[in-house]
C-alpha cells in the first residue's frame, strides 16, 4: 500500500472578517492509525488550532464526522474569523506512539488571508480655533483593515484637497493595518458652514467608501467688525449711540460701553441675527444724557469675542453742538495698549 499523503488542495483561502473559513484536508490512507491535528504556523512556536483526539475548540467544527472509522476527510471550519486568524494552516497526520503520538506527515499548508473592513474614519481638527487666512491641520484615522491596499481622499465642500500626507502602518506584514492622514486647509470667512471630509476606499467596501467629517464651525473664529453711529432722539438733551457688531463667529461675545474710559454698561450677546454664511450680527445702543456732561464725551464700544483680546471703536460726542446736527460717523480710536482698531 502506498504511504499516506496529506493533501491540502487550497494554497490560499480568502475570507471576510466575521465569516467562516473552510480549510480543506484529506488523507490518502487510513494508515498508520493516529489523529489529525491542525496548526497555524510551522516549527516549535506553532499554534494548535484543532486536535481530533482531545481538547476544546469552540470555534472549530469538522466538515465530516471525524469519529467515523473510514473518515479520511479532515477539513475544518473556523467560525467568526478576525484579522488575527490570518496565517498559514497545516493539517498534520500523527501516528500513534508512546508516550505521545508522533508527527507522521504534514500537508503543504493553506494560507488564510482575512479581508477586514476599515473602521469608520475619525476626523479631528485643531485644539484651538483659528481665524480666516490661517492654515489649519485635520487628521483622519481608520483602523483594522486588511489587506493593506487602501485609498484615502480629502474634500472640502465636495472639492478634493491636494495638500495632505498619508501613512499606512505597519510597513511590513501584519494581520491588520491602520491609516493616518493629515490635511492642511486654508480658512476663509465663509467657512462657518463648510465641512472637511475624509473618504476611505477599500476592497472590502465594494465601491461604497466610508466617510468621516469635521465641521469647520468647530475650528473657525471670525472676528467681528464694529461700527458706532449716533442717532438723534426727540428729547433735546438725549443722544442714542449704537454699536453694530457684524459678521462674527462663534456667538460668544461680551460688549462694554465706556464713557470717557469709565465702564457704563456690560452686556452679553443674546438675541443675535444669523447671516446666510453662518456668522452673526448684533447691535447694542446707549442712550446718553447730554445735559449731564459739561465737556465732550468719548464713547467707546469695546467687544471681547470668544475669549480673545478686546477690540473697540470710539465715537466723540460734542456736548456743545445740538444733537440733531451731530455727525454719525467717526474714526476709530485706540482705547488701550492691548486693544485693536477695527476699520
Amino acid at each position: 500500500e502506498e504511504e499516506l499523503q496529506v493533501i491540502q488542495p487550497d494554497k490560499s483561502v480568502l475570507v471576510a472578517a466575521g465569516e467562516t473559513a473552510t480549510l480543506r484536508c484529506t488523507a490518502t490512507s487510513l494508515i498508520p492509525v493516529g489523529p489529525i491535528q491542525w496548526f497555524r504556523g510551522a516549527g516549535p512556536g506553532r499554534e494548535l488550532i484543532y486536535n481530533q483526539k482531545e481538547g476544546h475548540f469552540p470555534r472549530v467544527t469538522t466538515v465530516s464526522e471525524s469519529t467515523k472509522r473510514k473518515n479520511m476527510d479532515f477539513s475544518i471550519r473556523i467560525g467568526n474569523i478576525t484579522p488575527a486568524d490570518a496565517g498559514t494552516y497545516y493539517c498534520v497526520k500523527f501516528r500513534k506512539g508512546s508516550p505521545d503520538d508522533v508527527e507522521f506527515k504534514s500537508g503543504a499548508g493553506t494560507e488564510l488571508s482575512v479581508r477586514a473592513k476599515p473602521s469608520a474614519p475619525v476626523v479631528s481638527g485643531p485644539a484651538a480655533r483659528a481665524t480666516p487666512q490661517h492654515t489649519v491641520s485635520f487628521t483622519c484615522e481608520s483602523h483594522g483593515f486588511s489587506p493593506r491596499d487602501i485609498t484615502l481622499k480629502w474634500f472640502k465642500n465636495g472639492n478634493e484637497l491636494s495638500d495632505f500626507q498619508t501613512n499606512v502602518d505597519p510597513v511590513g506584514e501584519s494581520v491588520s493595518y491602520s491609516i493616518h492622514s493629515t490635511a492642511k486647509v486654508v480658512l476663509t470667512r465663509e467657512d462657518v458652514h463648510s465641512q472637511v471630509i475624509c473618504e476611505v476606499a477599500h476592497v472590502t467596501l465594494q465601491g461604497d467608501p466610508l466617510r468621516g467629517t469635521a465641521n469647520l464651525s468647530e475650528t473657525i473664529r471670525v472676528p467681528p467688525t464694529l461700527e458706532v453711529t449716533q442717532q438723534p432722539v426727540r428729547a433735546e438733551n438725549q443722544v442714542n449711540v449704537t454699536c453694530q457688531v457684524r459678521k462674527f463667529y462663534p456667538q460668544r461675545l461680551q460688549l462694554t460701553w465706556l464713557e470717557n474710559g469709565n465702564v457704563s454698561r456690560t452686556e452679553t450677546a443674546s438675541t443675535v441675527t444669523e447671516n446666510k454664511d453662518g456668522t452673526y450680527n448684533w447691535m447694542s445702543w446707549l442712550l446718553v444724557n447730554v445735559s449731564a456732561h459739561r465737556d465732550d464725551v468719548k464713547l467707546t464700544c469695546q467687544v471681547e469675542h470668544d475669549g480673545q483680546p478686546a477690540v473697540s471703536k470710539s465715537h466723540d460726542l460734542k456736548v456743545s453742538a445740538h444733537p440733531k446736527e451731530q455727525g454719525s460717523n467717526t474714526a476709530a480710536e485706540n482705547t488701550g495698549s492691548n486693544e485693536r482698531n477695527i476699520y
Epitope: E1, L30, V33, G34, P35, Q52, K53, E54, S66
Partner: antibody, heavy 120, light 107 residues
Framework: QVQLVQSGAEVKKPGASVKVSCKAS????????IVWVRQAPGQGLEWMGW????????NYAQKLQGRVTMTTDTSTSTAYMELRSLRSDDTAVYYC?????????????WGRGTLVTVSS | DIQMTQSPSSVSASVGDRVTITCRAS??????LAWYQQKPGKAPKLLIY???NLQSGVPSRFSGSGSGTDFTLTISSLQPEDFATYYC?????????FGGGTKVEIK
C-alpha cells in the same frame, strides 16, 4: 481474509517464561498497533500493553512492567508477547487485538486467544 | 488511571426486551468509549466505537450514547443471540481500562 492467528495453548511452571505469537494477515500490518489483553478464568478483561507495529514503541500496564516484553517482526507481520517469572495468577487466556481507532483506542479484530496455564 | 464502572453487573431479560447498560468513567474521556460483546469461550467482539458509532456488521438494535463520563449501551429488542457479557472500554489514554462487565442472562 483479515485475521489474527495466535499460537497454541501453553502449560508453564511458576517462574518460567512464555512467548505467545500473533500473526496478522489480510491488512497492512505496520498501519495498526497491537494490544494484548488477558482474561483469567471467570474474570473480566485486563489490558496488558500496546505496541506500534510501525515503530515498535510500547506502553505496558504498570503491574506487568519489568515482566512483559512486546515485540513485532514486520517481515512476517507477527506480534509477540513474552511474560516472564510466571505465577499461578498469570493463568489466563491471552488475546492479541488490532487497534482500529484513529485518534483513540478500540479493537476491531481479535485473535482467538491462547490459554496459558501456570501450574507446578 | 481511569476507572470504568459498569452497572448492573448482571441483568435478567426476555427476548424482545429493551436492555440498557451504563458505564461511568472516573474522569472525562470525551467520546472515546467502546462496547464489546463476549460469549463464553470466544474473543470479545467490537459493537460500538467512539461512544455512538456502530461497528460495521453489527445489528442496528445496538446503540450507544454519552460523552464525558457517562455512557449507555442500549439493546432495543433483545434477541436470543444477544445473551452474553458486555464490556465497556475507555480508549482515551493509556493505560487502557475495561469495565467489570455486565452479564445479560435469560429470564
Amino acid at each position: 481474509q483479515v485475521q489474527l492467528v495466535q499460537s497454541g495453548a501453553e502449560v508453564k511452571k511458576p517462574g518460567a517464561s512464555v512467548k505467545v505469537s500473533c500473526k496478522a494477515s489480510g491488512y497492512t500490518f505496520t498501519g495498526y498497533g497491537i494490544v494484548w489483553v488477558r482474561q483469567a478464568p471467570g474474570q473480566g478483561l485486563e489490558w496488558m500493553g500496546w505496541i506500534s507495529a510501525y515503530a515498535g514503541e510500547t506502553n505496558y500496564a504498570q503491574k506487568l512492567q519489568g515482566r512483559v516484553t512486546m515485540t513485532t517482526d514486520t517481515s512476517t507481520s507477527t506480534a509477540y508477547m513474552e511474560l516472564r517469572s510466571l505465577r499461578s495468577d498469570d493463568t489466563a487466556v491471552y488475546y492479541c487485538a488490532r487497534e482500529a481507532g484513529s485518534s483513540w483506542y478500540d479493537f476491531d479484530l481479535w485473535g482467538r486467544g491462547t490459554l496459558v496455564t501456570v501450574s507446578s | 488511571d481511569i476507572q470504568m464502572t459498569q452497572s448492573p453487573s448482571s441483568v435478567s431479560a426476555s427476548v424482545g426486551d429493551r436492555v440498557t447498560i451504563t458505564c461511568r468513567a472516573s474522569q472525562g474521556i470525551s467520546s472515546w468509549l467502546a462496547w464489546y460483546q463476549q460469549k463464553p469461550g470466544k474473543a470479545p467482539k467490537l459493537l460500538i466505537y467512539a461512544a455512538s458509532n456502530l461497528q460495521s456488521g453489527v445489528p442496528s438494535r445496538f446503540s450507544g450514547s454519552g460523552s464525558g463520563t457517562d455512557f449507555t449501551l442500549t439493546i432495543s429488542s433483545l434477541q436470543p443471540e444477544d445473551f452474553a457479557t458486555y464490556y465497556c472500554q475507555q480508549g482515551a489514554s493509556f493505560p487502557i481500562t475495561f469495565g467489570g462487565g455486565t452479564k445479560v442472562e435469560i429470564k
